[in-house]
């Protein structure tokens, strides 16, 4: 318990103190007092450095004194032989004696009293930053005007904290700038801008003068900027050492100015402004930004448009562009959206053709359509090569997105006809020599396939049966063979409007316009035994000359039989029409003069008895194409004749090409358009 005074006596005082003694006294006076310790008697064995016996006075860790020997007062009016004044409120006194004393020593008598200390002057470290006021038992600190005493009750500082700056532009300076800033202060300034703006601080070198760093490089006074988890500084010295433009990337900035007790300089002045938060110019592959700018900031909106062949897929919907906004956090909205290659998907299949499974269906991929060669070819050109275009469609250079159309190759027999022996006077043939040959079973006749949906024949073949049964692809027309061949079902029969319908067809003498078309219900699949014949062109190249050779085929009457079971064929030259007129009609049903001969008829035959006959009607008179001699076209259709084995008359198909085309176009299916 602290006391204000006290007495300390050596053991047995005033008798001699014993040997081998160590005794200590802990003196404590109240807080805020010092101790005045004084000795009125001192008689202790003398030794060098008081090594044998001594009284030791210790203040904290410091030895205030060590006494031995004999002392007497120098002042006749005072009994004090030795005294100590310490500004602390604790003191330790230790008495030690060794094992022997040569004489009898009486020890010491000492007294202590609590004394007032002047904290304001008695210490090396001044307790107050500014004004120190001493009183008995303590002191208090006070401050100059405009300063306030900190919570530690010792330090004065200016009231420079708590300012919050929210304006988009402003200026902040150290207290008293440009006069010296206050010592021992911590000034905190807060800049708080609207989200989406970053604080940008600008300083001039000459506007900064803060006490320089110590030898270790530590700032004694410092200016620090803190933006979120980023810190700029500490800065100190003469002239601003940091970047003159600090982009904080944050809308909140704390400015902390810390000063110590010494070395005041003029301080600092800065300007700040709110920059809209920049968003990075991101490298978004396969796209362009509109508008294109060197820098994008908060609230900027860009349209990101995918390059041709790329699209942004959100859910199941594909778009070619999207909008992105520079947000308050410096990040772009919709940043997850990306321009991906357009996917054209699995290409559509086509009739009578194929497309290889593509390795890829993405933008730029290439596919190739092919037709089922050699029976089909690509009608609408373009080569069949399509690439996956930017709009997600498979596109061809010529056709665009339109699919290729595989149409039958016409006029090309798989096996060319060769006369093996000497129809009338003809040779056995194979259906592969005449794959266009169509068999009509009622009446027994022929026709020519001209495309997938149409059969060309003579009008007199179908005038009595508008629903004929037809077969293709068979050399033999035996019932058992026909069962295995392809039967064609008619949808409609179109007889040429110029064909005169008679009540008694058997008595006919006028075969002008002996031509008809049969529209089929279903398309015919082409192959080696079924393939159409070409139609003639309308140019003069397709005008026949006398002597031009043509091929006829059919299952009609031969020299030996009324009807052939196996296909027969013959090669006939074109003859002048007069040659047909000159032949006497075999079984006339009327006067010879009644028979009509017109420019719509071709006369052919007269060579080695080769001719068409009853049952061959409607079959094609096939002539080599004048320009593409690997093909045959239907120059004529077996129509009538004066006498089998001589000359025959054939409908001149060239004169009906317009009617044929018009009829087919007007009665086509959408698939054929």
């Amino acid at each position: 318990e602290p006391t204000m005074y006290g007495e300390i006596l050596s053991p047995n005082y005033p008798q001699a103190y014993p040997s081998e003694v160590e005794k200590s006294w802990d003196i404590e006076v109240p807080e805020g007092y010092g101790i005045h310790l004084y000795f009125t008697h001192l008689d202790i064995e003398l030794s060098e450095n008081c090594a044998y016996d001594s009284v030791q006075i210790i203040s904290g860790d410091t030895e205030e004194g060590r006494l031995c020997g004999q002392r007497s007062s120098n002042n006749p009016h005072s009994p004090i032989v030795e005294e100590f004044q310490v500004p602390y409120n604790k003191l330790q006194v230790i008495f030690k004696s060794d094992f022997s004393n040569e004489e009898r020593f009486t020890g010491f008598a000492a007294y202590y009293v609590a004394t007032d200390i002047n904290e304001c002057t008695d210490f090396v470290d001044v307790p107050c930053s500014h004004f120190c006021n001493n009183f008995i038992g303590g002191y208090f600190c006070s401050c100059p005007p405009e300063y306030f005493l900190h919570d530690d009750m010792k330090n004065c500082g200016v009231n420079c904290s708590g300012d919050v700056f929210t304006a988009l532009i402003g200026e902040i300076a150290s207290p008293n700038y440009p006069k010296p800033y206050p010592e021992n202060s911590r000034c905190e300034y807060q800049i708080r801008l609207e989200k989406g703006f970053q604080v940008v601080v600008t300083l001039r070198r000459e506007d900064f003068d803060v006490e320089a760093a110590d030898s270790a490089g530590n700032c004694l006074d410092s200016l620090v900027f803190v933006a979120g988890d980023r810190q700029f500084g500490p800065y100190c010295g003469h002239g601003f050492p940091g970047p003159l433009n600090i982009e904080t990337k944050s809308n909140a900035l704390d400015i902390i100015f810390q000063t110590d007790l010494t070395g005041q300089k003029k301080g600092w002045k800065l300007r700040y402004h709110g920059d809209p938060m920049p968003c990075p110019k991101e490298d978004t592959p396969n796209s362009v930004w509109e508008p294109a700018k060197a820098k994008y900031v908060f609230r900027d909106v860009v349209q990101i448009t995918c390059l041709d062949g790329f699209e942004v897929v959100e859910g199941r919907v594909g778009a070619t562009s999207f909008y992105s906004t520079c947000q308050s956090n410096g990040k772009w909205s919709n940043s997850k959206l990306k321009c991906q290659p357009v996917d054209c998907g699995i290409p559509e299949s086509i009739e009578n053709g194929k497309v290889e499974d593509p390795e890829s269906t993405l933008f730029g991929s290439v596919i190739r359509y092919t037709c089922e060669e050699p029976y089909y070819y690509m009608e609408n050109g373009g080569g069949g090569e399509y690439h996956c275009a930017g709009n997600g469609s498979w596109v061809n250079e010529v056709l665009g997105p339109e699919l290729p159309k595989c149409v039958p190759v016409c006029g090309v027999p798989r096996e060319p006809f060769e006369e093996k022996q000497r129809i009338i006077g003809g040779s056995d043939a194979d259906i592969k020599n005449f794959p266009w040959q169509v068999f009509f079973d009622n009446p027994w006749a022929g026709g020519a396939l001209i495309n997938e949906y149409w059969v060309l024949t003579a009008a007199h073949v179908v005038e009595g049966n508008r629903e004929p049964t037809m077969y293709v692809g068979s050399t033999s027309v035996q019932t058992s063979r026909l069962a295995k061949s392809k039967m064609l079902t008619p949808e409609h029969v179109f007889i040429h409007p110029g064909w005169k319908l008679l009540e008694v067809p058997e008595g006919r003498t006028n075969f002008d316009n002996d031509i008809a078309l049969v529209r089929l219900k279903d398309p015919v699949k082409m192959g080696p035994t079924v393939s159409p014949i070409c139609l003639p062109g309308t140019s003069s190249d397709y005008n026949l000359m006398d002597g031009d050779l043509g091929l006829i085929s059919g299952w009609g009457r031969t020299e030996k039989r009324d009807r052939a079971v196996r296909l027969k064929a013959a090669r006939l030259p074109v003859a002048p029409l007069r040659k047909c007129k000159e032949v006497k009609v075999e079984k006339p049903t009327a006067d010879a003069e009644a028979y009509v001969f017109t420019p719509n008829m071709i006369c052919a035959g007269g060579e080695k008895g080769m001719d068409s006959c009853k049952g061959d009607s409607g079959g094609a008179f096939a002539v080599q194409d004048p320009n593409d001699k690997t093909k045959f076209y239907a120059a004529g259709l077996v129509s009538w004749g004066p006498q089998c084995g001589t000359y025959g008359l054939y409908t001149r198909v060239k004169n009906y090409v317009d009617w044929i085309m018009k009829t087919m176009q007007e009665n086509s299916t959408p698939r054929e358009d």
Epitope: E373, P374, Y377, V409, V412, P416, E418, E419, D541, M545, D546, G547, D548, L549, R571, P573, V574, E607, Q624, P626, N627, D628, K629, T630, K631
Partner: antibody, heavy 112, light 110 residues
Framework: SLEESGGRLVTPGTPLTLTCTVS????????MIWVRQAPGKGLEWIGV?????ITYYASWAKGRFTISKTSTTVDLQITSPTTEDTATYFC??????????WGPGTLVTVSS | AYDMTQTPASVEVAVGGTVTIKCQAS??????LAWYQQKPGQRPKLLIY???NLASGVPSRFKGSGSGTQFTLTISGVECADAATYYC????????????FGGGTKVEIK
């Protein structure tokens, strides 16, 4: 017009392709023939390609030559030339007015 | 097979004279026959098509005739410019053919 190219000196057995480049008409509508003429000899027909791409060859030329076409060219490949194949090779358009259009020819020399 | 035999192999004729060249087909080819003229180092030139039709720009002294298997080219009033080799060509089929051309007839002017 027609123009042959590709003729050169080759060693026996080295395949060689001659090309006939056409302009002014469509190959899809015409028959094109290849004809050759050995030095001091007559015209010898090799083969033909039709508008649809069908080909026919002279009986002696089958297997020795291959004819193919694109939209603007007709090719003749001599699969394994021998010294007897040394000749000027012509391509011609063969129409209803016969060989109405011929190229100038290209010389092929086969020598070891 | 369709083969063409041309005769004679060569012929000499005086200026102003007449030359007759014959061509025979092994099978009937109707009128599908053409005649060509070829001068050394040049491409063949079409003279006659469809057996008897004169090609464009060909002088009327050239005349073709025949049908079926027998055909003839006649050059009347021969001129020096007519010195050349003449070929016939069957224009009917490409199937089963060794050569569509005849062997050629060389016409020399005296």
């Amino acid at each position: 017009s027609l123009e042959e190219s590709g003729g050169r000196l080759v060693t026996p057995g080295t395949p060689l392709t001659l090309t006939c480049t056409v302009s002014g008409f469509s190959l899809s509508s015409y028959t094109m023939i290849w004809v050759r003429q050995a030095p001091g000899k007559g015209l010898e027909w090799i083969g033909v390609v039709g508008g649809s791409g069908i080909t026919y060859y002279a009986s002696w030329a089958k297997g020795r030559f291959t004819i193919s076409k694109t939209s603007t060219t007709v090719d003749l490949q001599i699969t394994s030339p021998t010294t007897e194949d040394t000749a000027t090779y012509f391509c011609a358009r063969d129409t209803s007015v016969a060989g109405d259009l011929w190229g100038p020819g290209t010389l092929v020399t086969v020598s070891s | 097979a369709y083969d063409m035999t041309q005769t004679p192999a060569s012929v000499e004729v005086a200026v102003g004279g007449t030359v007759t060249i014959k061509c025979q087909a092994s099978q009937s080819i109707g009128v599908s026959l053409a005649w060509y003229q070829q001068k050394p180092g040049q491409r063949p030139k079409l003279l006659i098509y469809k057996a008897s039709n004169l090609a464009s720009g060909v002088p009327s002294r050239f005349k073709g005739s025949g049908s079926g298997t027998q055909f003839t080219l006649t050059i009347s009033g021969v001129e020096c410019a007519d010195a050349a080799t003449y070929y016939c060509q069957q224009d009917y089929t490409y199937s089963d053919v060794t050569n569509i051309f005849g062997g050629g007839t060389k016409v020399e002017i005296k």
